[in-house]
Amino acid sequence: WELTILHTNDVHSRLEQTSEDSSKCVNASRCMGGVARLFTKVQQIRRAEPNVLLLDAGDQYQGTIWFTVYKGAEVAHFMNALRYDAMALGNHEFDNGVEGLIEPLLKEAKFPILSANIKAKGPLASQISGLYLPYKVLPVGDEVVGIVGYTSKETPFLSNPGTNLVFEDEITALQPEVDKLKTLNVNKIIALGHSGFETDKLIAQKVRGVDVVVGGHSNTFLYTGNPPSKEVPAGKYPFIVTSDDGRKVPVVQAYAFGKYLGYLKIEFDERGNVISSHGNPILLNSSIPEDPSIKADINKWRIKLDNYSTQELGKTIVYLDGSSQSCRFRECNMGNLICDAMINNNLRHADEMFWNHVSMCILNGGGIRSPIDERNNGTITWENLAAVLPFGGTFDLVQLKGSTLKKAFEHSVHRYGQSTGEFLQVGGIHVVYDLSRKPGDRVVKLDVLCTKCRVPSYDPLKMDEIYKVILPNFLANGGDGFQMIKDELLRHDSGDQDINVVSTYISKMKVIYPAVEGRIKFS
């Protein structure tokens, strides 16, 4: 019996087609993805093949102005229109709290939303009961397929799920649910979830009875043969894991941002064993036309976005200096504003020992593309922020050793004075440079804000300690020459859309007046 699994993950609000790098579409003839194009391909496969499932492995939320404005209603509407069969909860589905998940998505979705390792407690338990499920048995042709969901157990550190949701270990939580499916005589089981490729592989290895793993979170691109675009494969598609009980389990993921549609064909024998698996992600490029009816619906929903981008978010009573003359040479108040917003967006009270789980921010000065003049009645709009942060990136959470951070700050000034973008703006860090010293030895003082303290204060950076840092995804991926970050990071979790982080902070503060306050000094 042959099953076709179509899958997406980490779409992150890319409802409209995008450029090849998943930023805003500029030249329509070269654009990719988007739900209208996705629908065309899905329908084409549904017409051609008998047993098809369309699955999403989480993180539909967060990433463009679509989410900022519609807050998840757009996800429910267009996923319903595409007739998704199931979705797993990702960490970003909790970005607007549990209410921001329940009302727009859980209550509106016409497909099951799954996670076996999220357990509700207290007053939330009855409120959310039945709105998401640990698993769902789906009829496919004459057969049934069990889909069991999972979500990153790190979600409380990455989003805002509140105190009434417990995120259990994925493997521990999945096994009893899979066992339950087996007792219901379901012998074809897909684990669909959002914990990253390493965890996906562990699930394939450790959870008895899982036949296929469809994952997300790590934006992993897998491909067999010559890849069709710029993404470099992390392995073959499907990636085969040998389970502890001796079975070959295919593991798949489909990069991110709706650029590809994962396409996996599985052949099962009469006992429910996977006897063959093959496929590849399908690049959703302009050779695939956008479906006219979905496109028309997108255009209708688009109108509200255009209105939103000119509305006032808040006010500034000072000039927001985002000029390259400042931000690539010294501390600039636009850099301070953005870093403060980044930390504020990551406030998660960990426990009594920690005031927060992260206190530090770094931001490449070259990523700040425009100032904002306060003399326009102080008004700040989304449109203004889009000029400051035009690249559609994310502000991510990484874990780095102190020694890696030291290298990063040396790189920040290794060719100082040439107006290059690698000069770092900071938050929760005090750095002193001596430019008279040779490159690679210019950082003379590097103090960082403690997290394991009730009163935050600055302590010298320890080379062997592991620190959490918020930074642009551009830096996490080694951009602007920060190869040491890419090579040495110990963990990387993608975060929220950059503009959204700053706009939310400005809306929250109402009036802002960031200063230059001695975060970066020269001796």
């Epitope: 019996w1 042709g141 004459d142 057969e143 040998t242 001796g246 070959k248 024998d269 009469e270 006992r271 064993n273 996977v274 006897i275 063959s276 093959h278």
Partner: antibody, heavy 112, light 107 residues
Framework: QVQLQQSGAEVVKPGASVKISCKAS????????INWVKQRPGKGLEWIGK????????DYNGNFKGKATLTADKSSSTAYMQLSSLTSEDSAVYFC?????WGQGTLVTVSA | DIQMTQSPSSLSASLGERVSLTCRAS??????LIWLQQEPDGTFKRLIY???SLDSGVPKRFSGSSSGSDYSLTISRLESEDFVDYYC?????????FGGGTKLEIK
């Protein structure tokens, strides 16, 4: 659990036909191919062909086209193989098989 | 048609010994290979599917692997019930084809 139960041994005359059956249980019969295999002592195993009961699709080994005819009855979850114009070369044990499970075999003896 | 050349055709070995049987495919079969065990009464049992996946209920002393066009079944420590016949079967392309079989005998 999955079971494939074949009909009993047959003794047939040369030139005649024989139809052997394979009743399936423990799974959705219409969703999986049923294979037929021939085993003769000292001749190893030969794949005859397969049938997809859901729509009756068949796929034959060229060596058995015209010799074997595969059919299936969804209502009784039974697959059939008819062998025609029998000769002594057709004397063998015939097995039906899924991908995982095999029938117990049916001995066909062609003898005058 | 894809030829499956199975070797050895017979093998004498002792209890507790480790043995390997090999099937060589004449064309690429993309790991679509089954190993079957046939009891003296004619009963077939599948041991391995998809080259290396172990069927449920099959002892872990059985394992399958591949290297290029060579596919192997290894029994790590022979037990008395293992002295029977073994066949490989490719299901990559029609007509499916079997190896000639290996008779495993006790020394």
């Amino acid at each position: 659990q999955v079971q494939l139960q074949q009909s009993g041994a047959e003794v047939v005359k040369p030139g005649a036909s024989v139809k052997i059956s394979c009743k399936a249980s423990g799974y959705v019969f219409s969703s999986y191919w049923i294979n037929w295999v021939k085993q003769r002592p000292g001749k190893g195993l030969e794949w005859i062909g397969k049938i997809f009961p859901g729509n009756g699709d068949t796929d034959y080994n060229g060596n058995f086209k015209g010799k074997a005819t595969l059919t299936a009855d969804k209502s009784s979850s039974t697959a059939y193989m008819q062998l025609s114009s029998l000769t002594s070369e057709d004397s063998a044990v015939y097995f039906c098989a899924g991908f995982a499970d095999w029938g117990q075999g049916t001995l066909v003896t062609v003898s005058a | 048609d894809i030829q499956m050349t199975q070797s050895p055709s017979s093998l004498s070995a002792s209890l507790g010994e480790r043995v390997s049987l090999t099937c060589r495919a004449s064309q690429d079969i993309g790991e679509r290979l089954i190993w079957l065990q046939q009891e003296p009464d004619g009963t077939f049992k599948r041991l391995i599917y998809a080259t290396s996946s172990l069927d449920s209920g099959v002892p872990k002393r059985f394992s399958g692997s591949s290297s290029g066009s060579d596919y192997s079944l290894t029994i790590s420590r022979l037990e008395s019930e293992d002295f029977v016949d073994y066949y490989c079967l490719q299901y990559a392309s029609s007509p499916y084809t079997f190896g000639g079989g290996t008779k495993l005998e006790i020394k």
